[in-house]
Amino acid sequence: FERTRSLQDPCSNCPAGTFCDNNRNQICSPCPPNSFSSAGGQRTCDICRQCKGVFRTRKECSSTSNAECDCTPGFHCLGAGCSMCEQDCKQGQELTKKGCKDCCFGTFNDQKRGICRPWTNCSLDGKSVLVNGTKERDVVCGPSPADLSPGASSVTPPAPAREPGHSPQ
């Protein structure tokens, strides 16, 4: 089948890094500078991605593969193949249309990205607050108030702080 196909279509013999040049009687020509073809049998080469502005070149373009970008310090990648760069904020902040803003009271963000999330409500689990929350850290829940009353036979060890979920990007 491959042999039959190549007899019918001479372009199928053109390897990655080349294109089938219709202007030159379907000869396989190398991709011009700043272009690539990642598969054989291509009739054109694709333009290489340019990493400019906040985008930095992580991998140079070659004749067979596109350039790959990441983001300059102070920014992080979003989207497939780092299609976007989004600004970092400090812990205790979230990014808004107005730039980085401090988390409101009762919320926290322990990362440089994502949104401020509400402190854990310890009382929902029948527990008390062992360590107060901050803009950067969730509260730490401790034993229930009943466990701390005089004469209680045993004290439950403090529950570990919950692992904060990552906000969807």
């Epitope: 976007m84 989004e86 990014l95 808004t96 969807p168």
Partner: nanobody, 123 residues
Framework: EVQLVESGGGLVQPGGSLRLSCGAS????????MLWFRQAPGKELEWVAN????????YYVDSVEGRFTISRDNAKNSLYLQMHSLRAEDTAVYYC????????????????WGQGTMVTVSS
Amino acid sequence: EVQLVESGGGLVQPGGSLRLSCGASGFTFSSYWMLWFRQAPGKELEWVANVNQDGSENYYVDSVEGRFTISRDNAKNSLYLQMHSLRAEDTAVYYCARGGEDYGNSHFGMDVWGQGTMVTVSS
């Protein structure tokens, strides 16, 4: 090809004014948030201002509030940054950038950047 090209940078004295332009091509300009960033020598890239699709909503970093004005002309596919009362600390390369699809709702990422224009404030 999607492209942003800045112009209008130059040398200006402290207290002076300058207007930067950013010409857009290869996409429907009026469908996107647009932003200005700057990078001072030896510093990280800093957000300066942004404007929504029709120009009715805009925001500024505190250090330029009241001195800089971001605007756009969708008929001309152009973004502008009018800068007044310029200070030495405004010296930087200024970049325009396009907010990605759904900017301001699900994310605040930028997907297209210009090459930058240099602004030097010095006496």
